[in-house]
């Protein structure tokens, strides 16, 4: 015997209180698949989050981060502060890369310069806080 709720499309819920008719999701909620018995609350992009895609009756809202921050985690679950190139984010804020390390992005950590001698090469262009060394022949 087929479940009558399976006929309810995305954007609706199967209303058990009304002989399992398909009722539209309330505002600020959605159902992305058919046959659901409830709708899900839409994600709200507040504070440092901003709305990249509005919630609809069939899909959740999508957030990204306000300028000066970048997304972390699945579905942009967190926003992390940007730093400048040549810096990394620490508990005390953005700090310059130590000598011998670099970061060419606004996120992530400072990484050591390439050791050219390990490949039997010499340094062609010196490294900076923002750029790795360039190895030569």
């Amino acid at each position: 015997l087929q479940d009558p709720c399976s006929n309810c499309p995305a954007g609706t819920f199967c209303d058990n209180n009304r002989n399992q008719i398909c009722s539209p999701c309330p505002p600020n909620s959605f159902s992305s698949a058919g046959g659901q018995r409830t709708c899900d609350i839409c994600r709200q992009c507040k504070g440092v989050f901003r709305t990249r895609k509005e919630c609809s009756s069939t899909s959740n809202a999508e957030c990204d981060c306000t300028p000066g921050f970048h997304c972390l985690g699945a579905g942009c679950s967190m926003c992390e502060q940007d730093c400048k190139q040549g810096q990394e984010l620490t508990k005390k804020g953005c700090k310059d890369c130590c000598f011998g390390t670099f970061n060419d992005q606004k996120r992530g950590i400072c990484r050591p310069w390439t050791n050219c001698s390990l490949d039997g090469k010499s340094v062609l262009v010196n490294g900076t806080k923002e750029r790795d060394v360039v190895c030569g022949p």
Epitope: F13, D15, N17, S23, C25, P26, P27, N28, S29, R37, T38, C39, D40, I41
Partner: nanobody, 122 residues
Framework: EVQLLESGGGLVQPGGSLRLSCAAS????????VGWVRQAPGKGLEWVSA????????YYAESVKGRFTISRDNAKNTLYLQMSSLRAEDTAVYYC???????????????RGQGTQVTVSS
């Protein structure tokens, strides 16, 4: 017991106005997310308007934006829908509804009244 009693419907000419009322009992209207749904002849339910987040934001269906206004009187525990510039396609039974938030995180809605018939015709 939760009760919702709608009134104010009737027959009106295109371009006319009506004000629907919903008297609530058994719960405090101002502490709930509430609104109006409608069912046109031969069609499914459609959300028309709602007051969400304890009175913070309002929702209007695209088809009624700029024509309908939702409000509530907390002292009278009554919800209103002011309808203007009415069109034939607004003909429907209008129900007062309460959004229900379930413990597991799901959302549904509940409407207990008989609804009020709005007919827009010349």
């Amino acid at each position: 017991e939760v009760q919702l009693l709608e009134s104010g419907g009737g027959l009106v000419q295109p371009g006319g106005s009506l004000r629907l009322s919903c008297a609530a009992s058994g719960f405090t209207l101002s502490a709930e997310d509430v609104g109006w749904v409608r069912q046109a002849p031969g069609k499914g339910l459609e959300w028309v308007s709602a007051i969400l987040d304890f009175g913070g934001s309002t929702y209007y269906a695209e088809s009624v934006k700029g024509r309908f206004t939702i409000s509530r009187d907390n002292a009278k525990n009554t919800l209103y829908l002011q309808m203007s510039s009415l069109r034939a396609e607004d003909t429907a039974v209008y129900y007062c509804a309460r959004v229900v938030y379930h413990a597991g995180g799901g959302v549904t809605f509940d409407y207990r009244g008989q609804g009020t018939q709005v007919t827009v015709s010349s």
